[in-house]
Amino acid sequence: KEVVLLDFAAMKGELGWLTHPYGKGWDLMQNIMDDMPIYMYSVCNVVSGDQDNWLRTNWVYREEAERIFIELKFTVRDCNSFPGGASSCKETFNLYYAESDVDYGTNFQKRQFTKIDTIAPDEITVSSDFEARNVKLNVEERMVGPLTRKGFYLAFQDIGACVALLSVRVYYKKCPEMLQSLARFPETIAVAVSDTQPLATVAGTCVDHAVVPYGGEGPLMHCTVDGEWLVPIGQCLCQEGYEKVEDACRACSPGFFKSEASESPCLECPEHTLPSTEGATSCQCEEGYFRAPEDPLSMSCTRPPSAPNYLTAIGMGAKVELRWTAPKDTGGRQDIVYSVTCEQCWPESGECGPCEASVRYSEPPHALTRTSVTVSDLEPHMNYTFAVEARNGVSGLVTSRSFRTASVSINQTEPPKVRLEDRSTTSLSVTWSIPVSQQSRVWKYEVTYRKKGDANSYNVRRTEGFSVTLDDLAPDTTYLVQVQALTQEGQGAGSKVHEFQTLSTEGSANMAV
């Protein structure tokens, strides 16, 4: 942006500049060009010997300018176009300036002026151009600065040329007010900070409803000496609830929202949300629908799932396999998990209590992703109730629970109590007992044994009695032994796995129980 301090051509001859000597030399004249009246200051004393004619502008207020640009449009006649070449004719003139804090009026003193440059034409007006009224217009520009006083004068010294000044324009440059990346940069005077730093760094301010992104750089631009903006750094983003429309931030329309400062546009409110108002940063969930803390605001609101479908409990002696299917209503979420809880009741007393500590699950019973689990180590003559709850990311936001239950009665025997009766270097004699009340239900006992540390092979012996001798064993070797009752319903509860050791060949008669 150019800020014009003086424009002779625009003043249509109304600027009364000072000429020295008065009444000689420079003269204000009017001409017709392109059917329009134009004004010019002209001098053409080319046959009168040495000349020293001065034309001084009116006093020009400097405003904020530090460096001024002087644009001259002028024409110079060819000295050879005059008869005899006009021996004292010149084809240049001199440009001067003087700074002052006050207007000296008609008090003109040459010594106050500093020469800026000798102004020479690129093109001179030869006779044929003059006659044909082809004005050979020259344009020259000079820069002066830094200026420090309140104002200044320009002066033109004629030394014997035939010259006409058609335009004298003095201006300084500003980087114009600008909107860039949602930041407003103020009108800035174009001035070099120093010779090594030709750019002035200017901080911008974010437009209404725009902010500097978190952790980002504030908007900066560089104003060059030529009044041009360069090298934008940083940016502003429309704040939550607002989106970029051209160079402004506009509130999100009703039914739309924007949750954070970003370059993104406002998004339509997702499913199961209430219609938002203008400038919404989020959309509230419909009644009965929720948003998990980790859910993005762009995601539909969801609700807890319904209970699992078709829960079945299949008893297998001391074990139960629980199977179920996914809920009919997932609540609109994929993050469904299941948790299994266990309650046991004593048939005699009707007392009930939690049984998590006494049973064993095939996998941890909370946050199950599969739809089956096996529960073992169930006690005989006990009623068990299993509850399978379906949960998703928003289940924690409501008090109600979605579960299905299944009950099962365990009728199997208690595990046998096993002890080592006798042993030798090659045999182990094992006995066991179970409550008398259960003995009639036992069909046989199954004794499973193997060497400790040998997972690949094991031996099984069945017997109807309460003891067995295991022969052909290796000396000084530890064996793992388990006894399990077999009933009509299937396997009963198994005993603990015991460790028994045969004697060494030179060993003692000590027994390990």
């Epitope: 017709i32 010019m40 002209s42 110079v76 006649r77 006779s127 044929s128 006659e131 044909a132």
Partner: antibody, heavy 128, light 107 residues
Amino acid sequence: EVQLLESGGGLVQPGGSLRLSCAASGFTFSHYMMAWVRQAPGKGLEWVSRIGPSGGPTHYADSVKGRFTISRDNSKNTLYLQMNSLRAEDTAVYYCAGYDSGYDYVAVAGPAEYFQHWGQGTLVTVSS
Amino acid sequence: DIQMTQSPSSLSASVGDRVTITCRASQSISTWLAWYQQKPGKAPKLLIYKASNLHTGVPSRFSGSGSGTEFSLTISSLQPDDFATYYCQQYNSYSRTFGQGTKVEIK
């Protein structure tokens, strides 16, 4: 020395034609704008027509437009004025005049010209 | 067309007198004005161009001034050779009109 010598004047009936000539010497004719200026007996000066150094452009006073034609032959250093459909009010002394931009000490040419050099004139009388 | 009006149309003066003739244009002609001198039976002679510039060979007692619409020709000290008719001419437009003339006679 600049010399301009008009010829071709005389008595002519209304509606008749006449061709005036102006012989130039003592200067470079092809550099000069040339013009015809007339002066009715006992009256003031009236510009009639002009022609540029190379033969154009040409301008005419409203009073003669369409009837008079100005021309020049730079090889012969001669200016002409062909006058047709003459009227009584065309009776006047016709001067040939010249302008050389070299003698016009101004930076920018004026919108038109003035006349630096004049011939002695030739009398044209239109009468029945 | 631009009309040029001279005044007075005639004047009587003595040798050595200072004489001023004025010329008024019907519209502004800047400084595009010439002055001519004409003696009886002779061709006009250029005295001044561009309102104030003296033509080559013209005595310095002649001077011109003015701009816009008001112009004047001054003879600072009238000489016997100066008794003649003086015409102004505008060349601000292609019509190049002359004033009606001012006759300077011996008193």
